[in-house]
């Protein structure tokens, strides 16, 4: 007798666990920026503080009739999903509501900004435990709303936002497109993307993960013990806000980067049917459904990584794409991907003291993506070693020459535009362990890291026959940090990481033309962190 | 994630002589004007003036006051609805779009964003 959504996100071993910190009271506070709410509802009574904050536009229409229960509907339901006594994810959590949406569910960017500033002021006046801000709203892309989210996130606040219900790229909406926000798409009881009339959940690279968002039972503002079902990415975001609140309740010192990495790592993978999304968005959209992760004490010092895609570079000849990790994360590798296969590779460079992953379009190309592998590596010291392109016919080798540094990723960037003359780069795991090897006209970049107990190895998988893609996975206990495509077909689309799987994509025409001798190889660098061990390269 | 996707950015670097004031003539607008790509979601007449990251508290107030003063010289009344101090330096203003060029040339201004709607999801 438990609603499907709670069953889905809270694994069996967590069901009876109390959502409390050791002293018996949760110190986590969730701020909800939404409509007004019915604080007397049994689900949330005693846990919710209705602040005096109110910044909403006038309702449209002269005949609009304000009915309290309708005005409170959206916010009350979400408050219930976060911390409701019976249908809530984080049942013990205290919640503060700020009214930024009117009775028609409309607000403004300026009202939302003033709301976020109100939270910051509250934080300054009376510092408390961990804060989670739930933003179950979306508007068009707003530079200032995203910037405000960034500033608030840098003060230690965790922001969770709805991806949007427009069946569109979430990057076109705010606050969904803010990188510092945990952006949540919606799935149904069958773990499929939510359809809402002719629209549905947003998708794309700006979505961090999905969560239940269809027919969610929660508090209804119609009466103090009423329930109703609502659907949308707001409901999905509320689930993740609840999960985050529970994680912080157990471990109040978890940072945004750790929370996001753990949410991704422990989510249910590959259950969403990606065919629902537009073809060009499928590779960019995470196939992840949120579940409550175990505590860090139960899971040890795992190496956690996530894949961050850049925006599309655009088709111009010198167009570049840039993918960035969060400030706390290490950029362990950089790869690139182009649907046309016309790309000039990828490299890592420092911009404003931060390493970024860059990819370059080639002449005649439709554009590229840079694909960063962003990892949490405690006490890491990482550096990039690069070697300029060698003369024709020669190989370029780069390895990690500092003591105790291991290779976590390779990047290759071709100087020449003519794709027919160049050979693909290679990682040679057997002959030359721990080296990146480039071929004609390629500059080679090696990402080298030192961290206590970090050890890495290369794993390759080649296919000679026709195949659209070649994959290689890191085995259990190892984490994929680098992914490249090795010599084979003259034209590859590039390589990228999907969870612990390295995917090398091959152009259709290349598949048809390829002789059986030209194997396309996916090469993965797999690492693990064993705090007691020394940094090492595993052959 | 945060590249400016489907977003309107308009350069309104209008001739600086337009005001005929010495301190303004020296300041050519490098600030940009931004607004929502979806026309129906725009709220023309309300603008968020975003100042440079390091702008001090007093400078925020001075910039808002300066805009009011210069607008008044042209016969426009503008209303400063809110001043942002804690998350970013800036202010929210209700004014005619005719004054955008003037506002963009104010010192410390990084960009101006037209207010727009957000919706429950």
């Amino acid at each position: 007798s438990i609603p499907w959504n709670l069953e889905r996100i809270i694994p069996a071993w967590h069901q009876t666990e109390e959502d409390r910190s050791p002293d018996g009271s949760s110190q986590v506070e969730v701020y909800l920026l939404d409509t007004s709410i019915q604080g007397a509802h049994r689900e949330i009574e005693g846990r919710v503080t209705i602040t005096d904050f109110n910044s909403v536009p006038e309702e449209d229409g002269t005949r609009f009739h304000r009915q309290a229960s309708k005005c409170d509907s959206h916010g009350t339901h979400l408050a219930g999903v976060v911390s409701g006594r019976d249908a809530g994810v984080a049942k013990g959590t205290s919640l503060h509501s700020l009214r930024v949406l009117n009775c028609q569910g409309k607000g403004t960017v300026s009202g939302t900004l003033i709301g976020l500033e109100f939270i910051r002021k509250s934080q300054l006046i009376q510092p408390s435990g961990p804060l989670v801000v739930l933003l179950p709203l979306a508007g068009g892309y707003s530079r200032i709303l995203n910037a405000a989210c960034r500033h608030l996130a840098r003060t230690g606040v965790v922001l969770v936002a709805a991806a949007g219900n427009f069946r569109d790229d979430a990057c076109l909406y705010s606050p969904a497109s803010a990188p510092e926000v945990i952006t949540v798409g919606a799935t149904n009881a069958q773990d499929q993307p939510v359809t809402l009339g002719t629209l549905g959940t947003n998708f794309g690279r700006c979505v961090d993960l999905f969560a239940p968002g269809k027919d969610i039972i929660g508090a209804s503002s119609d009466c103090s013990t009423c329930f109703m079902s609502q659907s949308g990415t707001s409901q999905a975001a509320a689930h993740v806000a609840g999960i985050v609140a529970r994680m912080l309740s157990r471990e109040p010192t978890l940072t945004l980067a750790e929370l996001r990495q753990r949410l991704i790592h422990f989510s249910t993978k590959d259950v969403i049917n990606m065919a629902w999304f537009p073809e060009d968005q499928q590779v960019l959209t995470p196939n992840l459904v949120a579940t409550l992760p175990p505590s860090t004490h139960e899971t040890g010092g795992q190496l956690l990584c996530r894949t961050v895609w850049s925006a599309h570079s655009g088709p111009t000849r010198t167009a570049t794409a840039t993918a960035r990790c969060a400030p706390e994360e290490e950029l362990l590798s950089c790869s690139s991907f182009s649907r046309s296969g016309r790309r000039r590779g990828d490299w890592i460079e420092a911009i404003g003291g931060q390493q970024v992953c860059k990819a370059l379009n080639a002449f005649g190309g439709e554009g590229v993506y840079a694909v960063a592998r962003c990892c949490l590596v405690p006490r890491a010291n990482c550096s990039i070693h690069n070697t300029p392109a060698a003369r024709a016919g020669l190989e370029t080798h780069v390895h990690c020459h500092q003591k105790d540094h291991v290779l976590t990723g390779c990047s290759f960037h071709w100087e020449v535009e003519d794709l027919s003359v160049r050979r693909q780069p290679a990682l040679r795991s057997r002959r030359q362990p721990g080296q990146c090897v480039g071929h004609q006209a390629a500059s080679v970049y090696a990402s080298c890291c030192h961290a206590p107990g970090l050890e890495c190895k290369i794993k390759e998988h080649g296919i000679s026959g026709p195949s659209e893609q070649v994959t290689v996975a890191c085995e259990a206990g190892w984490t994929l940090t680098g992914c490249n495509v090795l010599p084979g077909a003259s034209l590859t689309l590039g390589a990228y990481s999907v969870d612990n799987l390295c995917v090398a994509r091959v152009h259709d025409t290349a598949r048809a033309d390829r002789t059986s001798g030209e194997a396309t190889v996916a090469a993965a660098i797999c690492c693990r962190s064993r705090p007691s061990a020394k940094a090492s390269w595993v052959q | 994630q945060d590249e400016d996707g489907d977003y309107e950015e308009l350069m309104l670097a209008l001739p600086s002589q337009e005001d005929g004031l010495a301190d303004e003539a020296a300041h050519v607008a490098t600030a940009t004007f931004r607004r929502c790509s979806k026309e129906a979601w725009r709220l023309p007449g309300t603008y968020i003036v975003v100042l440079m990251e390091e702008t001090q508290r007093l400078q925020i107030e001075q910039t808002a006051h300066r805009l009011q003063t210069r607008a008044a010289r042209r016969g426009y009344v503008i209303k400063v609805l809110h001043i942002f101090y804690d998350l970013f330096p800036g202010f929210l203003v209700k004014m005619s779009s005719d004054l955008l060029g003037l506002a963009l040339k104010l010192p410390h201004v990084e960009y101006i964003e037209e207010d727009s709607f957000v919706f429950a999801q």
Partner: antibody, heavy 126, light 106 residues
Framework: QLQLQESGPGLVKPSETLSLTCTVS??????????WSWIRQPPGKGLEWIGS???????YYNPSLKSRVTISVDTSKNQFSLKLSSVTAADTAVYYC??????????????????WGQGTLVTVSS | EIVLTQSPATLSLSPGERATLSCRAS??????LAWYQQKPGQAPRLLIY???NRATGIPARFSGSGSGTDFTLTISSLEPEDFAVYYC????????FGGGTKVEIK
């Protein structure tokens, strides 16, 4: 079928704490589908809801009595209890315990009170 | 607090007659109103919930109607066992009960 039975002292002195227990039989108290409630009825008067609790111990009280009421649950004994502090003669009543469907699981039935215990009279007098 | 006022306080009727009981709320309770029957020395029993739905095992002679602030419980033809006190209760905001209507034999 499910039955509820109230127990506790029939006489309590003014300013003391009234304590009652409700024992549930024929079903488990540990279900997310239900709340367990206390309702009272002063002699010859109407009914007044006191408060409710779920199996996790999450409580919900009548605002007018909140400062004096504590409801607790013991799932191992399939019981829930009422404590009402600082009693006066106005607290003299028949005290009923009842089950209420929480509404979270619509299939569990209507979101109202029932079944009820048969009630126990508590008199506040010195 | 939502106050429920029941009228009349006492209704004197003969078996076979039609009984009409009224319950008025101080503010709208939508359709979140129930009717209970209480016989002397017994606990109340749920008759009607959500204004017009009969609870399990309740005879068809009992019916409820109304919404917002005005509600009616109708017993189409009184049986001897129907003589009792009837209470209305709302759950729009917390839980409150009406003062009761006693249906007695004329």
């Amino acid at each position: 079928q499910l039955q509820l039975q109230e127990s506790g002292p029939g006489l309590v002195k003014p300013s003391e704490t009234l304590s009652l227990t409700c024992t549930v039989s024929g079903g488990s108290i540990s279900s997310a589908s239900y709340y367990w409630s206390w309702i009272r009825q002063p002699p010859g008067k109407g009914l007044e809801w006191i408060g409710s609790i779920n199996y996790r111990g999450s409580t919900y009280y009548n605002p007018s009595l909140k400062s004096r009421v504590t409801i607790s649950v013991d799932t191992s004994k399939n019981q829930f209890s009422l404590k009402l502090s600082s009693v006066t003669a106005a607290d003299t009543a028949v005290y009923y315990c009842a089950r209420e469907n929480s509404g979270v699981v619509p299939a569990a039935g209507p979101n109202w009170f029932g079944p009820w215990g048969q009630g126990t009279l508590v008199t506040v007098s010195s | 607090e939502i106050v429920l006022t029941q009228s009349p306080a006492t209704l004197s009727l003969s078996p076979g007659e039609r009984a009409t009981l009224s319950c008025r709320a101080s503010q709208s309770v939508s359709s979140y109103l129930a009717w209970y029957q209480q016989k002397p020395g017994q606990a109340p029993r749920l008759l009607i919930y959500d204004a017009s739905n009969r609870a399990t095992g309740i005879p068809a002679r009992f019916s409820g109607s109304g919404s917002g602030t005005d509600f009616t419980l109708t017993i189409s033809s009184l049986e001897p066992e129907d003589f009792a006190v009837y209470y209305c209760q709302q759950r729009r905001n917390w839980f409150t009960f009406g003062g009761g209507t006693k249906v007695e034999i004329k």
